[in-house]
Interface confidence: medium
């Protein structure tokens, strides 16, 4: 029988009555244009909903918007449009919500053409009250909060001015003109690129990268001939034009741009691109596009300095700059990433790594699934996951893969089972061990979300017809119950739950459509009465992550350590609760050569775990070098993989070589790093 119909699945008793008492409908009695929803703060229950519609007139488009506020996780909403003087809010800027629990909100208003500047509405009390502020400029981007101080705001103007506010948008100061891109760094530092002559587009590759650490009082030029820049983890990256031709190279800094190193990565031409796929304080996943319109490139993983890169995955699917890739960080288990490759026959296949890009492999075929028509051998095939690339291709995939750090090991994704991704209607699959094994969870495409740190999974069928049924599981997707949340079906547009997967409330958004009426409606369901009791010690079981061979002493060792987690038993129907903290017990592993990558000037011959010196650094290899305050580079040929915590065991000792003669970089000479004051 189908999942959810077994006798043993009837564990949740009287759930219809329990859920009916906790289902709250809200009809937004005025519209059906577009709707955007933002959570304000963490565990506050405050949601802001901005509804917008445009009335097309002959000469112009007249817009109208309404603002609603809930403080009970969406069960009830109050129209607070009057707090923003019934002003039309620009949806392209969205609602700028302050970091952490600052309670700050900035809404950017639409103003008439002749006005001197834009207008914002600011709240510091979780949208209970708003202050109107007229700006001395027209904003081009949403207001950007400093991650360290939510009173500090940054914005670019339509005239490419860089504006800063130190008092949460009350007063603004233009600190620089001719700015293309600006970003907050750490410690309230601002990085930005600026053009000297024409415009951002015309000067691409000739931009300067500047830094201010005092909100615009003084500046330092930290890069020239810049194409673009990015921040990832503790790394600052700059894509820099080469002297002689139109190629560009990645340079890396770990000291906010004071010193730079040239990354040991291939240079790219005009039509190619670099992309930071993922970055943390330890390392970076970098995609380097192949020459030509191939739609793929190579993934490289960095060392702890962001300088030395190991080739991680060939033929990585990534269509164009700013295009789509399937690269997914599985946040529910350390070291796990999923992505897609474009094989020689142009089919797309999914690959997974469990060790932060060290090795990639196909996903194991789910036990309860057959190989589809793409499989040559009906007994041997793999699971292939649909991610944002599939969504961009308009396949019937309503959601990207889902994982949450506090729902340990759980990964939910649409996929197909065969030799490659299929364009047929996908099913939904779940892994409870971070991607090692998979099970078909739901037939056909669905929207899904995780509640109560994995204690409940909720799903809604993706259908063009109106729906009125929600499915939920209390055992990590093995068994499903269905609940009819409304008598009158709605056209479903989205599921909303508080970010962080700790909530037990889910909001179902959609619209009703009848001959006379088309309006937004939300149903918020609180599952608190389904999980009646708090989980106790007996409800949890010990689970060793990354375990593939229990007989092996090193079983579960990934990046030099193994972790045991306390995980909720599938049979336990109880609340993890909002304050649930993942309990894990790490233990250090012995080092092997697998825990090291080859340093600059060294490589691993195929099928060998030893690093050997490159015979000679010649030609363009000479540019792969370290430039900084130090005059020389020393190495023993091995470098510990970033984040690897192994101890003892293999300790590769090498004669230290001085490579300074082999290495030059001309990115920035210290004399160019002049300081400027306002």
């Amino acid at each position: 029988s189908a999942p959810g119909e077994d006798e043993e699945c009837g564990r949740v008793r009287d759930f219809v009555a329990k859920l009916a008492n906790n289902t709250h409908q809200h009809v937004f009695d005025d519209l059906r244009g577009s709707v955007s929803l933002s959570w304000v703060g963490d565990s506050t229950g405050v949601i802001l909903v901005l509804t917008t519609f445009h009335v097309p007139l002959v000469i112009m488009t007249f817009g109208q918007s309404k603002l609603y506020r809930s403080e009970d996780y969406g069960k009830n909403f109050k129209d607070i449009t009057d707090l923003i003087n019934n002003t039309f809010i620009r949806t392209e800027f969205g609602m700028a919500i302050g970091p952490e629990n600052s309670g700050k909100v900035v809404l950017t208003a639409e103003v008439s053409g002749g006005s001197r500047g834009g207008r914002i509405f600011r709240s510091s009390d979780f949208a209970k009250n708003f202050v109107q502020t007229d700006l001395p400029f027209h904003p081009l981007t949403q207001m950007m909060y400093s991650p360290q101080n939510s009173d500090y705001l940054l914005a670019l103007s339509t005239e490419n001015g860089l504006w800063v506010s130190k008092n949460f948008g009350g007063k603004w100061e233009e600190i620089h003109k001719a700015v293309c891109l600006a970003k907050w760094g750490s410690d309230n530092t601002i990085f930005f690129t600026t053009y000297a002559n024409g415009s951002c587009k015309a000067d691409l590759g000739a931009l300067e990268l500047w830094r201010t650490s005092d909100l615009g009082k003084s500046f330092k030029t930290i890069g020239v001939k810049i194409y673009s820049f990015g921040l990832g983890g503790r790394f600052l990256f700059a894509s820099v034009m080469a002297d002689k031709d139109t190629t560009r190279r990645i340079h890396v800094s770990t000291d906010q741009g004071d010193t730079w190193s040239m990354a040991q990565l291939p240079s790219v031409g005009q039509e190619q691109f670099y992309s930071i796929l993922a970055a943390n304080d330890d390392m970076v996943f970098m995609h380097v596009d192949e020459p030509g319109d191939t739609g793929f490139g190579t993934i490289f993983t960095s060392d702890d300095r962001g300088i030395v890169y190991s080739k991680s995955l060939d033929r990585h699917l990534y269509t164009t700059t700013g295009g789509e890739t399937a690269f997914t960080n599985v946040t529910s288990l350390r070291g796990v990433y999923i992505t897609s490759v474009l094989s020689e026959d142009n089919s797309i296949q999914t690959m997974i790594t469990f060790d932060q890009g060290g090795r990639w492999t196909h996903l194991r075929k789910p036990e309860n699934s057959e190989c589809d028509a793409t499989a040559k051998n009906k007994n041997e095939c793999s699971l292939h996951i649909h991610a944002s690339y599939s969504i961009s291709q308009k396949l019937n995939v309503p959601m990207a893969p889902l994982s949450e750090p506090n729902a340990v090991g759980i990964v939910i994704a649409h996929g197909s089972v065969g030799d490659a991704i299929s364009v047929m209607v996908p099913d939904v699959y779940i892994s409870d061990d971070g991607g090692y094994s998979w099970t078909k969870m739901l037939e056909g495409p669905h929207y899904y979300t995780i509640l109560d740190s994995g204690g409940i999974i909720v799903a809604i069928e993706h259908s063009s017809r109106p729906i009125n049924v929600i499915k939920f599981s209390t055992d990590e997707g093995q068994c499903w119950q269905t609940y009819t949340f409304t008598r009158d079906p709605i056209y479903f547009t989205g599921l909303a739950s508080e970010p962080g997967a700790r909530s037990m409330n889910i909001s179902i958004w959609g619209f009703t459509e009848s001959f006379l009426t088309s309006q937004w409606v939300s149903y918020t369901i609180d599952f608190k009465d389904i999980l009646e009791r708090n989980c106790e010690e007996k409800d949890y079981t010990i689970w060793l992550a990354h375990s593939t061979d229990p007989e092996d002493y090193e079983d579960g060792c990934i990046l030099g350590y193994k972790e045991q987690f306390l995980r909720l038993r599938k049979s336990s129907v109880c609340q993890n609760g909002r304050d649930y903290v993942v309990t894990k017990q790490p233990s250090i592993c012995l080092c092997s050569l697998e825990d090291f990558l080859c340093d600059f000037g060294y490589y691993r011959p195929e099928n060998d775990s030893k690093c050997v010196e490159q015979p000679e650094l010649k030609g363009h290899d000479l540019e792969f070098c370290l430039y900084g305050r130090e005059e020389h580079l020393t190495t023993n040929g091995y470098r510990k993989i970033p984040g690897d915590k192994c101890q003892g065991g293999v300790n590769p000792v090498r004669e230290v070589k001085d490579l300074k003669k082999k290495c030059t970089s001309n990115f920035l000479s210290p004399e160019k790093q002049n300081s400027k004051s306002n």
Epitope: D30, L31, R32, G33, F53, E513, F515, L516
Partner: antibody, heavy 124, light 106 residues
Framework: QVQLVQSGAEVKKPGSSVKVSCKAS????????ISWVRQAPGQGLEWMGG????????NYAQKFQGRVTITADESTSTAYMELSSLRSEDTAVYYC?????????????????WGQGTTVTVSS | DIQMTQSPSTLSASVGDRVTITCRAS??????LAWYQQKPGKAPKLLIY???SLESGVPSRFSGSGSGTEFTLTISSLQPDDFATYYC????????FGGGTKVEIK
Amino acid sequence: QVQLVQSGAEVKKPGSSVKVSCKASGGTFRNYAISWVRQAPGQGLEWMGGIIPIGGWANYAQKFQGRVTITADESTSTAYMELSSLRSEDTAVYYCARQGRKTGYYYYYGMDVWGQGTTVTVSS
Amino acid sequence: DIQMTQSPSTLSASVGDRVTITCRASQSISSWLAWYQQKPGKAPKLLIYKASSLESGVPSRFSGSGSGTEFTLTISSLQPDDFATYYCQQADGHITFGGGTKVEIK
């Protein structure tokens, strides 16, 4: 300015069907609804049903359920009303009207543009 | 279906008079009510929508009020062009019209 132009007068035998067309010109067709209203000689207005062209969503008054079919062709901006099993009491002037809907775009219920009317006579 | 009852069915008045027509719904229809004017041999013309909003191009002597179940159309100063039949129409569920009020010359 939006105009609704209806097809010409019809004389029908009892038991037969009539199909009246209503073509919109000069404005948006799809976001509104088209209502059909009839008026028997010397009587008041009677709503028969309507359609939302954008989704082909038809809606009928209880009295006419099963006897009336309302359709729309977005490509030609034309709505149609077909009434079957005609009887003498169906003799009336049939109007189409543009019906505002309670949506983000047209925020009222009111028939703001009307066709000129089509006289249908049912007689043996 | 919601029933709409209009009163009076006939009303005799003179030019310059203030005229009031009432429409009662069998259940609450919020503000989803429209008023129309119809002259013999012509299609109806929308005067008021959403109970009190004046359709563009309609003279300001026409006004609508009410919500829930009781609604009123008022002509503040009757003009020669205003002698016609007036209909109310609800649009809360299926559409229904009132029976009409004929305004004739006294």
